[in-house]
């Protein structure tokens, strides 16, 4: 049958009493038991006496009696009784248990940490009890942090309990530091203070600081630096592991730096002299902080005596392209120890040619890739002190995209206007390496009247591949290749030669290699009007006749056709527009805008000018024709000048009657 | 003893703005939170903050955070509120408290008499 | 928000007798440190709102033992053993589980 709980003769979960008065605690049970007591009361053996009897009736009742005479403040805390042996089958110790609270005016504090602070380790998000417990439940206890705030309870993650002190449900940051609990008795101030630490387990890295794998030659020392860096408040336990442990090969040195303001570092670093070859394998540094841990290891590999073996990466012979940012041209290595490099270029030291070669390793780094790196590459590799040289040649091929010389130097901002039926010699000279071919391509205008320009893909009409006999667009008399020096570099130069210039449209060229293609677009143009504008006047008429002017331009060159009259008045040239484009009359090359002015008189005379837009450049062109009514007095003949908007105009022909300007 | 002092009444306009106060004294000002409460005609209690007098921290319920400013003036133990942009909605009395919290052994809390404040033009 | 729900007017009771206010929030206020989180206040006519009950179950300090309080997590009752004359006013339950604290609509004691 189940025991009852042992009984204390003083009742409920509290009992305040004051010091220097005697405790009296009975624990009355039915089966032998023991007293579970605060710490301090546990070392008096002067003042604590326990008395055990037989009790109850028939003395079949276990008696114990608690005497803690002149109590102490410092004797607060539980006393329980529990039974000595509970059967197996309860898990569950019996025990009752009463706290006392030993009051004392003088000390209202049960552990008094006046002077130097008390240490509470912490740790943040966890639970962190300020263990400022009070010797009477009825004290007002303050937590103060410094050095100004009060941290208040508010019931839930900051309570207070008279029994434990302060408990702080989750720590933060904000606990860190010296906290003190205050408490006023009779108008007395008492302070117990607390510094609150925050232990870490945080390792931040852990490193080796020696290359990996590790070479060294028989017989030679090995040094690896095991670096663990920590937070300021982080101790760590640093271990090696490796395949000669059984043997105490190695020797450990450690240290800390805590120079650092954030950052703890440790230090662990391993020694073997006289490396042999069973110390060759796999070393492992270990950190362990609390429940954290990190590792790194590194590999040991032992040579007999110094080695190079040298090879080609790819293959022996190389490409790149001109105008790369950077090349890298690099071999395969493999020596011990590591040897002196030197690359030559076309037999001479690679990084005294040019500013924009750098040795990298094994490696030659190319800046900046022109055509002039192109050449035979030698790595030279020594290990002086062992007498162990090798070295080994690659050849660079540095393409070249290809480039089109008349594109460069071409400085026309116009289309270039090809005469009707004449014979024509178009070129292009391309440069590359490899070698670029040429091919010529036939993209036709679009033969809309309306249309006033020919832009390449300005319609849904392809180009058309181009070879000397060729039916499509102007009939081809030749397309002959040939090599042209220029600029002291070999240039090929392709010439298709038009035999009669008929039929507008675009030739284009192209050269490609294996790097890229570039073409050049030429507009041929064709005009059936000298220089491509043209002003035609049929005679100059007397009074009452009528004045006949005709205003050509190239179609492709020149929109809005416009006729205009230059009247001056008050010193100022005024343009008038005397006819409109909407009258003009498209043909396949050209645009005729025609202006009759029907019975002209003498005020009718001026300067008569046709006006035109280039289509390229946007500027206006006029031509202009100074038009004289013969009457009886003059006769002079119309002078004809073609001159841009900008430039200035001048009567070259005035009558002797009153003509109104 | 502890006291929490407040003025009995305070008329305010539309719009305007109103600056209570509630002066404490018969205890370490610095040593427990300050509420403020409101009471409506007629109607229950709404929280609408707390402030820590000792380092001016505040905390508030998010339906007044625009409405309501908390501060403290330890030199005098008083906590203020002031209240913007009034509206007859906020025809209210409103009361400060002082709460302690001790778990497990008394609890005990303080409140003003509250400042009854009427939005009228 | 945590809502708290009150029954506007208690049964009336005669005086000597005891009675029980109801109060039920939307969530349960038991925190994982084991404590509910359910206070009780009574506003007398014309008086600040005065604490009785912290912490679903625990007596304010100064508050006579003819009050207790029980509960679950989400409901909760308020008893008054024998009902005297000055027990009349308004009693509210509140919670501070989560912010903003939040207080029931209040019931109102009634006597017979």
């Known amino acids: 049958s189940k025991l009852k709980d042992p009984e204390l003769s003083l009742k409920g979960t509290q009992h305040i009493m004051q010091a220097g008065q005697t405790l009296h605690l009975q624990c009355r049970g039915e089966a032998a038991h023991k007293w579970s007591l605060p710490e301090m009361v546990s070392k008096e053996s002067e003042r604590l006496s326990i008395t055990k009897s037989a009790c109850g009736r028939n003395g079949k009742q276990f008696c114990s009696t608690l005497t803690l005479n002149t109590a102490q403040a410092n004797h607060t805390g539980f006393y329980s009784c529990k039974y000595l042996a509970v059967p197996t089958s309860k898990k569950k110790e019996t025990e009752s248990a009463i706290y006392i609270f030993i009051s004392d005016t003088g000390r209202p504090f049960v552990e008094m940490y006046s002077e130097i602070p008390e240490i509470i380790h912490m740790t943040e998000g966890r639970e962190l009890v300020i263990p400022c417990r009070v010797t009477s439940p009825n004290i007002t206890v303050t937590l103060k942090k410094f050095p100004l705030d009060t941290l208040i309870p508010d019931g839930k993650r900051i309570i207070w309990d008279s029994r434990k002190g302060f408990i702080i449900s989750n720590a933060t940051y904000k606990e860190i530091g010296l906290l003190t609990c205050e408490a006023t008795v009779n108008g007395h101030l008492y302070k117990t203070n607390y510094l609150t630490h925050r232990q870490t387990n945080t390792i931040i890295d852990v490193q080796i600081s020696t290359p990996r794998p590790v070479k060294l030659l028989r017989g030679h020392t090995l040094v690896l630096n095991c670096t663990a860096t920590t937070p300021l408040n982080t101790r760590v336990q640093m271990t090696w592991s490796y395949p000669d442990e059984k043997n105490k090969r190695a020797s450990v040195r450690r240290r800390i730096d805590q120079s650092n303001s954030h950052a703890n570092i440790f230090y662990s670093v391993l020694t073997i002299d006289k490396m042999q070859n069973k110390d060759k394998g796999l070393y492992t540094c270990r950190v362990r902080s609390g429940p954290s841990f990190k590792s790194v290891n590194t590999s040991v590999h032992i040579y007999d005596k110094a080695f190079i073996t040298v090879k080609h990466r790819k293959q022996q012979v190389l490409e790149t392209v001109a105008g790369k940012r950077s090349y890298r041209l690099s071999m395969k290595v493999k020596a011990f120890p590591s040897p002196e490099v030197v690359w030559l270029k076309d037999g001479l030291p690679a990084t005294e040619k040019s500013a924009r070669y750098l040795t990298r390793g094994y490696s030659l780094i190319i800046k900046d890739v022109t055509e002039e790196d192109a050449g035979n590459y030698t790595i030279l590799l020594s290990i002086k002190q062992s007498n162990v040289f090798k070295n080994l040649t690659a050849t660079l091929i540095v393409n070249v995209k290809p480039q089109i010389y008349e594109k460069a130097v071409s400085s026309f901002p116009d289309p270039a206007l090809y005469p009707l039926g004449s014979r024509q010699i178009l070129t292009c000279t391309a440069y590359g390496i490899p070698q670029p071919t040429i091919k010529w391509f036939w993209h036709p205008c679009n033969h809309n009247h309306s249309e006033a320009r020919c832009d390449f893909c300005s319609n849904n009409e392809e180009s058309f591949i181009l070879d000397a006999d060729s039916n499509m667009g102007n009939r081809i008399e030749s397309i002959t290749q040939r090599m042209a020096i220029i600029e002291g570099k070999n240039k090929m130069a392709s010439t298709l030669v038009v035999a009669d210039s008929r039929i507008s449209g675009i030739y284009i060229c192209i050269a490609s290699n294996k790097v890229g293609t570039v073409g050049r677009n030429i507009s041929f143009y064709i005009t059936d009007v000298p220089n491509g504008f043209h002003v035609n006047l049929e005679k100059m008429p007397t009074e009452g006749e009528d004045l006949k002017l005709s205003c050509t331009v190239n179609k492709f060159l020149y929109r809005d056709v416009t006729w205009i009259l230059l009247r001056t008045v008050n010193n100022r040239t005024m343009h008038y527009s005397i006819s409109k484009q909407k009258m003009a009359i498209t043909k396949e090359h050209s645009i005729t805008l025609n202006l009759t002015i029907m019975n002209v008189s003498l005020q009718d005379s001026g300067t008569y000018a046709c006006r035109a837009r280039n289509v390229y450049t946007g500027e206006e062109i006029l031509q202009k024709k100074e038009i004289t009514i013969r009457g009886e007095h003059c006769n002079k003949k119309a002078v004809f000048s073609r001159i841009s908007k900008f430039k200035s105009t001048r009567n070259d022909c005035t009558t002797q009657s009153n003509v109104k300007h | 003893q502890v006291q929490l002092q407040q003025p009995g009444a305070e008329l305010v306009k539309p719009g305007a703005s109103v600056k209570l106060f509630c002066k404490a004294s018969?205890?370490?000002?610095?040593?427990?939170?300050i509420y403020w409460m409101r009471q409506r005609p007629g109607k229950g209690l709404e929280w609408i903050g707390e402030i820590n007098p000792s380092n001016g921290d505040t905390t508030f319920n998010e339906k007044f955070k625009t409405k309501a400013t908390l501060t403290v003036d330890k030199s005098s133990s008083t906590a203020y509120m002031q209240l913007s942009s009034l509206t007859s909605e906020d025809s209210a009395v409103y009361y400060c408290?002082?709460?302690?919290?001790?778990?497990?052994?008394?609890?005990?809390?303080?409140w003003g008499q509250g400042t009854s404040v009427t939005v009228s033009s | 928000d945590i809502v708290m729900t009150q029954a506007a007017f208690s049964n009336p009771v005669t005086l000597g007798t005891s009675a029980s206010i109801s109060c039920r929030s939307s969530k349960s206020l038991l925190h994982s440190n084991g404590i509910t989180y359910l206070y009780w206040y009574l506003q007398k006519p014309g008086q600040s709102p005065q604490l009785l009950i912290y912490?679903?179950?625990n007596l304010a300090s100064g508050v006579p033992d003819r009050f207790s309080s029980s509960g679950s997590g989400t409901d909760f009752t308020l008893r008054i053993s024998r009902v005297e004359a000055e027990d009349v006013g308004v009693y509210y339950c509140a919670q501070n589980l989560e912010l903003p604290w939040t207080f029931g609509e209040g019931t109102k004691l009634e006597i017979k």
């Open positions: 018969g205890y370490t000002f610095t040593n427990y939170y």
């Open positions: 408290t002082r709460p302690s919290f001790y778990s497990y052994d008394y609890y005990k809390d303080y």
């Open positions: 912490q679903m179950s």
